[in-house]
């Protein structure tokens, strides 16, 4: 069964800046990755970025840089300032759509006890 992993890290240099990394463990052709916060995209979450392997990347504030790390993993850096910036207990979710298996998603947040720079 395919799985999705999510890591959330707060940057040591910018305490309100986050890096989210997500990966897909499974076979099939990844068609789309959707990153959201505040819950899954289909359950009230707000889309931060959509990554397509052929048609490019779309991102919305406070997302600063979304990119493919490998064919099956992505990373997203969030801006740390402004009214829409994330807080330490924000939930981030990644949904990988794989053809023809379907979609697989997982969520993660910064561990309560984590220091800046520590991975979830």
């Amino acid at each position: 069964t395919p799985e999705v992993w999510v890591q959330v890290r707060m940057e040591a240099t910018e305490l309100s800046s986050f890096t989210i990394r997500c990966g897909f463990l499974g076979s099939g052709s990844i068609s789309l990755v959707t990153v959201s916060w505040g819950g899954p995209n289909g359950a009230g979450g707000t889309t931060l970025a959509v990554l397509h392997p052929e048609r490019g990347i779309r991102q919305w504030a406070p997302a600063r840089q979304a990119r493919w790390e490998t064919q099956s993993s992505i990373s997203l850096i969030l801006e740390g300032s402004g009214a829409s910036s994330p807080c330490a207990n924000t939930t981030f979710c990644c949904k990988f759509a794989s053809f023809p298996e379907g979609s697989w998603e997982a969520c993660g947040s910064l561990p309560p006890s984590s220091d800046p720079g520590l991975s979830a």
Partner: antibody, heavy 120, light 107 residues
Framework: EVQLVESGGGLVKPGGSLRLSCAAS????????MSWVRQAPGKGLELVSA????????YYPDTVKGRFTISRDNAKNSLYLQMNSLRAEDTAVYYC?????????????WGQGTLVTVSS | EIVMTQSPPTLSLSPGERVTLSCKAS??????VAWYQEKPGQAPRLLIY???HRFTGIPARFSGSGSGTDFTLTISSLQPEDFAVYYC?????????FGQGTKLEIK
Amino acid sequence: EVQLVESGGGLVKPGGSLRLSCAASGFTFSSYHMSWVRQAPGKGLELVSAISRDGDSTYYPDTVKGRFTISRDNAKNSLYLQMNSLRAEDTAVYYCSRHEDYFGFAMDSWGQGTLVTVSS
Amino acid sequence: EIVMTQSPPTLSLSPGERVTLSCKASQSVSNDVAWYQEKPGQAPRLLIYYVSHRFTGIPARFSGSGSGTDFTLTISSLQPEDFAVYYCHQAYRSPWTFGQGTKLEIK
């Protein structure tokens, strides 16, 4: 304008074979996953085969597995369905459809359909 | 396999009426739900994707809603051309499945 045009349907005896074709135009065929969906007389819609944009991943339900083979030729903008060991219950209108990754794999374009009748 | 159950199977209504069609999934399908309209002798047509997004050219009287396992398609004021069969569809998990359809007929 997106166009999908099916051909190859007809009357065939039980146990016989048919090859359906779908000619695509008006879009970059190689960027889209494709499917064959059928509708038997008085019945609902059934997805009978799907293929990823690069042709590497395919899907078949148990009802046709081992009898039907989906393939594509991206150089010719064409989708195919080879149907062997046909049965009376395979009688249906067969539609070629295009999946849109950005729409959760919803099928946003359909052909007009080609009728396959399996009867002795 | 995720089973999509539509209700009712048939509805008899008059033009101008408001109608709500129901689709229930046997397990959560996130937001990967679409609705199609099919008329006799015509190919199915995509109406709604991602639960609530209207496809290009679809009139505003069509709307979709729901989450998790319960989804609805609403037509705010039926027009003569809306009498057809409507199918919900999930592409969340393979095997992708359709509901059995709801037929809207003129009363």
